[in-house]
């Protein structure tokens, strides 16, 4: 077990916009003072030290020894720092990809944005909250996976042909559920167990196949942390 | 090599003010956060004060809140505590302390300490 | 504010020995736990921060582990040099606070 593997795992899917949770009990009755908060996230890359941005040395402190349980860790940086007038510094590549909230700070939340999230984001990360009279932290790790549909067999389909659709995240544990359904015009239809249709776990197997089945055909993989992914795939059945 | 040194008159009696200096070498002082932690006689350690690098943000143990005030010379390298209203209980051996970074709450370096000792 | 209890005052051990020192936290900390050791006549030294992290310098013998309430130090084979107080001490919020310390003795 690799330390940090004990904070709080938040899980994305890479290419899509990641949200970081840091709502912070706060003992404060006064929520006007949420003005003055400061907010600092770091990031501990899980492999491959982050390159300095020019002009943005990383933060000082102690260069952090092999943990007791793990091999030489890449040195953390600041992604985003924004002080108590509102004013922001991070590291330059990420700058556009993060966000914070600034009506979600007022109200105590101090969640990280990524938008995206890509794979050099995973590793651990630490919001430290200052507010005027107590200072205090979240810490969780983020782990990113790939979401993908495949056919089997793969390609264009004729018809009364079969194919097996699986849907698929890469993330150790089986989602908690899995539902499909067909992207019609009017939105999305629900696909049930049927004759045509046999749904077991992630795959969907279509018997026989016909034109009307070519189009878009999604998934949606809930997880038990309630982290979801929607996946999509377009068939093509010829006449 | 990192050094924090303290300095300060260790003898008041009760009602009395103090100030505690903390000289700091080795490191970029501007560049960490600080604290002053306290050690009582029967070994305790308590946190008592922290500044940030900045001195944006000041937090006191609410023992001391209102009667200790912590303070920074960045050009001089000196960490200040200044202490008034004293009382008995606020005897202990006094740590000037580096913090890790602003942002992670822990104390990598620790000075000699500078007793203080609160009697009449 | 968050209390760090150290259940053991004293524990003594013999040289080669591998000894355990628990700290529990009164509410969750997730990782957010330092150790240090503090020599007779001598200042507190980090050994361990978030949990489980050697601190620069720090022998390997010296390794920490937990998350959330409950934290252990471990000694995996005592040296007479490890005569010292321990402490624990959270730095997820503030106030920042210790646990009682624990005694290392060696018999």
């Known amino acids: 077990l690799q330390p940090g593997a004990e904070v709080p795992v938040v899980w994305a899917q890479e290419g899509a916009p990641a949200q970081l949770p840091c709502s912070p009990t706060i003992p404060l009755q006064d929520l006007s003072l949420l003005r003055r908060a400061g907010v600092t996230w770091q990031h501990q890359p899980d492999s491959g030290p982050p390159a300095a941005a020019p002009g943005h040395p990383l933060a000082p402190g102690p260069h952090p020894a092999a943990p007791s349980s793990w091999g030489p860790r890449p040195r953390r940086y600041t992604v985003l720092s924004v002080g108590p007038g509102g004013l922001r510094s991070g590291r330059l590549p990420l700058q556009p990809r993060v966000q914070l909230d600034e009506r979600g700070r007022q109200r105590g939340d101090f969640s990280l944005w990524l938008r995206p999230a890509r794979r050099a984001d995973a590793g651990e990360y630490r919001a430290a909250v200052h507010l005027r009279d107590r200072a205090l932290s979240c810490r969780l790790r983020l782990r990113l996976g790939q979401a993908s549909m495949t056919a089997s067999p793969p390609g264009s389909l004729r018809a009364s042909d079969w194919v097996i659709l699986n849907c698929s995240f890469s993330r150790p544990d089986r989602p908690a559920s899995v539902h499909w359904f067909r992207n019609r015009g009017q939105g999305r239809v629900p696909v049930r167990e049927s004759p045509h249709h046999h749904l077991a776990e992630s795959f969907l197997f279509l018997p026989q196949v016909s034109p009307m089945d070519s189009g878009p055909w999604g998934c949606i993989l809930t997880y038990r942390d309630g982290f979801n992914v929607s996946i999509m795939y377009n068939l093509t059945v010829l006449g | 090599d990192v050094k924090l040194v303290e300095s300060g008159e260790d003898l008041v009696k009760p009602g009395g003010s103090l100030k505690l200096s903390c000289a700091a070498s080795?490191?970029?002082?501007?560049?960490?956060?600080m604290s002053w932690v306290r050690q009582t006689p029967e070994k305790r350690l308590e946190w008592v004060a922290y500044?940030?690098?900045?001195?944006?943000?000041?937090y006191y143990a609410d023992t001391v809140k209102g009667r200790f005030t912590i303070s920074r010379d960045d050009v001089r390298n000196t960490l200040y505590l200044q202490m008034s209203s004293l009382k008995s209980e606020d005897t202990a051996m006094y740590y000037c302390t580096r913090v890790a970074y602003d942002y992670e709450w822990y104390f990598d370096v620790w000075g000699t300490g500078a007793p203080v000792t609160v009697s009449s | 504010d968050i209390v760090m209890t150290q259940s053991h005052k004293f524990m003594s051990t013999s040289v080669g020995d591998r000894v355990s020192i628990t700290c529990k936290a009164s509410q969750d900390v997730t990782t957010a736990v330092a150790w240090y050791q503090q020599k007779p006549g001598q200042s507190p030294k980090l050994l361990i921060y978030s949990a489980s992290y050697r601190y620069t310098g720090v022998s390997d013998r010296f390794t920490g582990s937990g998350s959330g309430t409950d934290f252990t130090f471990t000694i995996s084979s005592v040296q007479a040099e490890d005569l010292a107080l321990y402490y624990c001490q959270q730095h997820d919020s503030s106030p920042w606070t210790f646990g009682g310390g624990t005694k290392l003795e060696i018999k």
């Open positions: 500044v940030t690098s900045g001195g944006d943000y000041i």
């Open positions: 080795g490191f970029t002082f501007s560049s960490y956060a």
